[in-house]
């Protein structure tokens, strides 16, 4: 499956929007920094089937969408930027969904990749728990924004590797 050219442009736009969402100096948030244990192994060049990689990417973007579409995020972050971010993520999800259908087909079940998808879900659960524990403070949101920027960058790198393997 060939992801459209607009997909990588959308990735770049999403990253720019994430960068623009910064509302507070990270230097004032050093006490709040946190290790969310990003599931790096799910994004490494292991014997990854393309369908598995696409499923993991889809889950990553879906969870990012869920995280940023809560009322707490709307209260903490710029709504205009958030709206633009939702549009980019929605487009990404649509692109990846078409790919999943082509790569996996209806016969193969995404349950085959349950462990990888579960690892991504647990990662986002850790992020949500951290925000709750920190009472959704501005520093907590800044730490999470920085974390999502990095995980998003790693997702983009995986997409680039998939493309170069075609």
């Amino acid at each position: 499956c060939d992801l459209p050219q607009t997909h990588s442009l959308g990735n770049r736009r999403a990253l720019i929007l994430l960068a623009q969402m910064r509302r507070i100096s990270p230097f004032s948030c050093l006490k709040d920094r946190h290790d969310f244990e990003f599931p790096q192994e799910e994004f490494d060049d292991k014997q990854f089937q393309k369908a598995q990689a696409i499923s993991v990417l889809h889950e990553m973007i879906q969870q990012t969408f869920n995280l940023f579409s809560t009322k707490d995020s709307s209260a903490a972050l710029d709504e205009t930027l958030l709206d633009e971010f939702y549009i980019e993520l929605d487009q990404q999800l649509n692109d990846l969904e078409s790919c999943v259908m082509q790569e996996v087909g209806v016969i193969e079940s995404p349950l085959m990749y349950e462990d990888s998808i579960l690892a991504v879900r647990k990662y986002f659960q850790r992020i949500t728990l951290y925000l709750t524990e920190k009472k959704y403070s501005s520093c907590a949101w800044e730490v999470v924004r920085a974390e999502i920027m990095r995980s998003f960058s790693l997702s983009i790198n995986l997409q680039k590797r998939l493309k170069s393997k075609e």
């Epitope: 960068a19 230097f27 920094r33």
Partner: antibody, heavy 123, light 112 residues
């Protein structure tokens, strides 16, 4: 290949000003935080300033606060250090350095360094 | 400010043997998130510093596994298991726990 090419070092009189540049290539400059670190004649490393990827936030130690200004032009992939009211103790080799992508744990490891540019403050 | 203390010189070592370089911080560098924000940099003669170790014990990209690092939060040790001629230089420890970020004064690795 990541490269940080520095320029602007010079001999300057006490009280004078100087602007250092650091041209970045081989990576997406606008995605990385950057710092300036200096090495004094006795070979000590002294961290001078830091700037976020977008350039909105900066931080300086007390030794240079109010005299030095770090800035960046992401369109030109260049980092700057404007130094004014220079003192003899500012004499050093100045290095620009890129910060590793840290995510939520804010790892400010300096994973790539420029070749350095020499600043001498003397009358 | 957090003060990082290092000896100016290491004990002279023979090529092929192991070497240890120590560093001490004036405050624990162990963050409540479980990460120890201690770093090691090597500056070879005539070169810029290069990152060796991040977060106390993680090897930076391209660094040979002859290098390892451990510590308690305050006392840290960098170990080189089989010293090679190219390991000569000044080793600096640094902390990124708090601003301002600070470096040790550097330890020169001496070869017998």
């Amino acid at each position: 290949e990541v490269q940080l090419q520095q320029s602007g070092g010079d001999l300057v009189k006490p009280g004078g000003s100087l602007k250092l540049s650091c041209a970045a290539s081989g990576f997406t400059f606008s995605s990385y935080g950057m710092s300036w670190v200096r090495q004094t004649p006795d070979k000590r490393l002294d961290w001078v300033s830091i700037i976020t990827s977008g350039g909105s936030y900066t931080y300086y130690p007390d030794s240079v606060k109010g005299r030095f200004t770090i800035s960046r032009d992401n369109a030109k992939n260049t980092l700057y250090l404007q130094m004014s009211s220079l003192k003899s103790e500012d004499t050093a080799m100045y290095y620009c350095a890129r910060h590793a992508e840290g995510g939520g744990n804010y790892d400010y490891a300096m994973d790539y360094w420029g070749q350095g540019t020499s600043v001498t403050v003397s009358s | 400010d957090i003060v990082m203390t290092q000896a100016a010189f290491s004990n002279p070592v023979t090529l092929g043997t192991s070497a240890s370089i120590s560093c001490r911080s004036s405050k624990s560098l162990l963050h409540s998130n479980g990460i120890t924000y201690l770093y090691w940099y090597l500056q070879k003669p005539g070169q810029s510093p290069q990152l060796l170790i991040y977060q106390m014990s993680n090897l930076a990209s391209g660094v040979p596994d002859r290098f390892s690092s451990s510590g308690s939060g305050i006392d840290f040790t960098l170990r080189i298991s089989r010293v090679e001629a190219e390991d000569v230089g000044a080793y600096y420890c640094a902390q990124n726990l708090e601003l301002p970020f600070t470096f040790g004064s550097g330890t020169k690795l001496e070869i017998k």
